[in-house]
Interface confidence: low
């Protein structure tokens, strides 16, 4: 594939931010703010938590999530998985793109200890028009939202 | 706003590195090396710790800081905040852009245990000409500088 | 240096993924998958673990490694170093570009505790044609490979 950056075209880019509605508890991907504050879409669209590609090419995709808690709640997995996943019409299941596993609870030596951790992912992937990228965190109960600066999701064509 | 990448224009980019003078202890932002070693400025300028935008557009901005210590010094907050902040003529206060909170001290179970941690932030934001971006770390006493490779700050237009 | 992005040229980019052969145990850099799955090379080449630059310019280079273990093996350094290094024909030794140090073992308070951590590095550096960039992790015994999504290495011209 030859991908050229035309000088007269706007380069697709987006930055979506965490909001109170991001965590659904439904087992689905995180949802994002697309318009308010620092959030924007330029040459990409959004649907139900997903960045939707309108122009095929190589994209640097990234996400950060802010994790935090007090000790480790009972029943909470000791491993937190934060990942970027692709949904494509050509394949029935989500495909892992970039994934991190962390054990932040292990930092808290007493059950009442407050802890914070952050997970950042970024990398270049090829995306076709119509393909979607989503962010998932398992267990999402540890994601700490505030003002859109601590948990976010974005992409730009390279 | 339509932002075009003109084929004859240099794309703004910068990478600033940590130096002995980075930590001022004054409550201000971190200061950076702009010329020596790996540091450079291309189409961006620098003033008192800030990357200064000369051309409006969307920028991927990033920073990494190396944290480290021996146990947790008394009086040291258990939470470290590392953030990228915008200063704009249109608003009197700094605006949070990208922020992380971490509790690295919690890893050291004894007071004499040496620990290291790293915090990385990156994301796309829109910046107008004249706006400035700075890096802050609270508590900056935990930032470990060496040779410019472990703590740094940069940006490029996307 | 004036670096122009010509509208008719393909912008160099690459994303290399971790594979079973990545960890050599030889003290050398990590090796990477260049073709299968998510891996690709576009305007860059690869040799013995290194991304090789064919066109001089400023590149955003990045790497993530997935770390994990059960407690801390005897003889294992308490500090893990993850770095991107440059090899240049003009200098006999590797040059540190971007480096992180972490103490993930410190999270595990008992010797049988499973822990996970992730290290991400990214930043803009200038690279000449013929120069090479490699990833090193010390101690690489803690790098956990799976399917190319958890440990990776990439770059693109900015």
């Amino acid at each position: 594939l030859i991908q050229e950056r035309r000088s007269h075209e706007v380069n697709p880019a987006a930055h979506l931010t965490g909001a109170n509605s991001s965590l659904t508890g439904s087992g689905g991907p995180l949802l994002w703010e697309t318009q308010l504050g620092l959030a924007f879409l330029r040459g990409l669209s959004y649907h139900d938590g997903a960045l939707v590609v309108t122009k095929a090419g190589y994209y640097y995709i990234y996400s950060k999530v802010q994790l935090g808690g007090v000790g480790c709640p009972l029943g909470l997995a000791s491993t937190i998985t934060h990942g970027l996943y692709k949904r494509t019409p050509r394949y029935p299941e989500e495909l892992e793109l970039l994934v991190s596993q962390q054990s932040p609870c292990g930092r808290a030596t007493s059950s009442s200890r407050v802890w914070w951790d952050s997970s950042f992912l970024g990398g270049v992937v090829h995306l076709e028009a119509g393909e979607k990228v989503v962010v998932r965190v398992l267990d999402e109960r540890l994601v700490r939202l505030r003002d859109g600066t601590r948990s976010y999701f974005g992409a730009f064509m390279v | 706003l339509i932002q075009e990448r003109r084929s004859h224009e240099v794309n703004p980019a910068a990478h600033l590195t940590g130096a002995n003078s980075s930590l001022t202890g004054s409550g201000g932002p971190l200061l950076w090396e702009t010329q020596l070693g790996l540091a450079f400025l291309r189409g961006l300028s620098y003033h008192d710790g800030a990357l200064v935008v000369t051309k409006a557009g969307y920028y991927y901005i990033y920073s990494k800081v190396q944290l480290g210590g021996v146990g947790c010094p008394l009086g040291l907050a258990s939470t470290i905040t590392h953030g990228l902040y915008k200063r704009t003529p249109r608003y009197p206060e700094e605006l949070e852009l990208l922020v992380s909170q971490q509790s690295p001290c919690g890893r050291a179970t004894s007071s004499s245990r040496v620990w290291w941690d790293s915090s990385f932030l990156g994301g796309v934001v829109h910046l107008e000409a004249g706006e400035k971006v700075v890096v802050r770390v609270l508590d900056e006493r935990l930032v470990r500088l060496r040779d410019g490779t472990r703590s740094y700050f940069g940006a490029f237009m996307v | 240096l004036i670096q122009e992005r010509r509208s008719h040229e393909v912008n160099p980019a690459a994303h290399l993924t971790g594979a079973n052969s990545s960890l050599t145990g030889s003290g050398g850099p990590l090796l990477w998958e260049t073709q299968l799955g998510l891996a690709f090379l576009r305007g860059l080449s690869y040799h013995d673990g290194a991304l090789v630059v064919t066109k001089a310019g400023y590149y955003y280079i990045y790497s993530k490694v997935q770390l994990g273990g059960v407690g801390c093996p005897l003889g294992l350094a308490s500090t893990i170093t993850h770095g991107l290094y440059k090899r240049t024909p003009r200098y006999p030794e590797e040059l540190e570009l971007l480096v992180s140090q972490q103490s993930p073992c410190g999270r595990a308070t008992s010797s049988s505790r499973v822990w996970w951590d992730s290290s991400f590095l990214g930043g803009v550096v200038h690279l000449e044609a013929g120069e090479k960039v490699v990833v090193r992790v010390l101690d690489e015994r803690l790098v956990r490979l799976r399917d190319g999504t958890r440990s990776y290495f990439g770059a693109f011209m900015v």
């Epitope: 706007v10 697309t34 318009q35 308010l36 504050g37 620092l38 924007f40 879409l41 330029r42 040459g43 990409l44 669209s45 959004y46 309108t54 | 706003l1 339509i2 932002q3 915008k86 249109r90 608003y91 009197p92 605006l95 852009l97 934001v125 829109h126 910046l127 107008e128 | -």
Partner: antibody, heavy 122, light 107 residues
Framework: QVQLQQSGPELVKPGASVKISCKAS????????IHWVKQRPGQGLEWIGW????????KYNEKFKGKATLTADTSSSTAYMQLSSLTSEDSTVYFC???????????????WGQGTSVTVSS | DIVMTQSHKFMSTSVGDRVSITCKAS??????VAWYQQKPGQSPKLLIY???TRHTGVPDRFTGSGSGPDFTLTISNVQSEDLADYFC?????????FGSGTKLEIK
Amino acid sequence: QVQLQQSGPELVKPGASVKISCKASGYSFTSYYIHWVKQRPGQGLEWIGWIFPGSDITKYNEKFKGKATLTADTSSSTAYMQLSSLTSEDSTVYFCTREDYGISTYSAMDFWGQGTSVTVSS
Amino acid sequence: DIVMTQSHKFMSTSVGDRVSITCKASQDVGTAVAWYQQKPGQSPKLLIYWASTRHTGVPDRFTGSGSGPDFTLTISNVQSEDLADYFCQQYSSYPLTFGSGTKLEIK
């Protein structure tokens, strides 16, 4: 120069629908939000919602969900607002206006159409 | 919803005078406030955004100030063509809301 040219006055019957248009010129239509604002005589301004023509994403004031439907045709640089199930409460002037999305934080409405008067009468 | 209160429905002034029109937000909106002028039979025109930044082409006799809940539009050296309704608007959160307007009358 930037212009938003709205369609002419409408006289419609109660219960019917009406679709009013807003043709943009002098700027890149797909790079700005188009908002719609209602102004009843002698009263203030009420925000109805916006559409971003670049991706057909819409945002509505909860109060107008089900009442207003916003669409856009990028080929003609025209935004539309359809009002359904009309009652006398809908008799008023409607403005389209644009908002620059090019800054990192949202902005104000910098250019406005001349307004379209809708009269609901049997 | 954030309520923008313009307590004066009418204000009377003379040519050459200075007048201040106020607007109070029911919640903190930072400086995400705009001011619009609407002359009789016309559509609104943007005067001020980000509480204090003049829009292109707006005469410098129009000045915006304030942050948090309290905002002021000041017109110094009032001219006869300034006869109009003035509306404040917050764009800090949805739904976007406007003040009820202040009608400036020239004596």
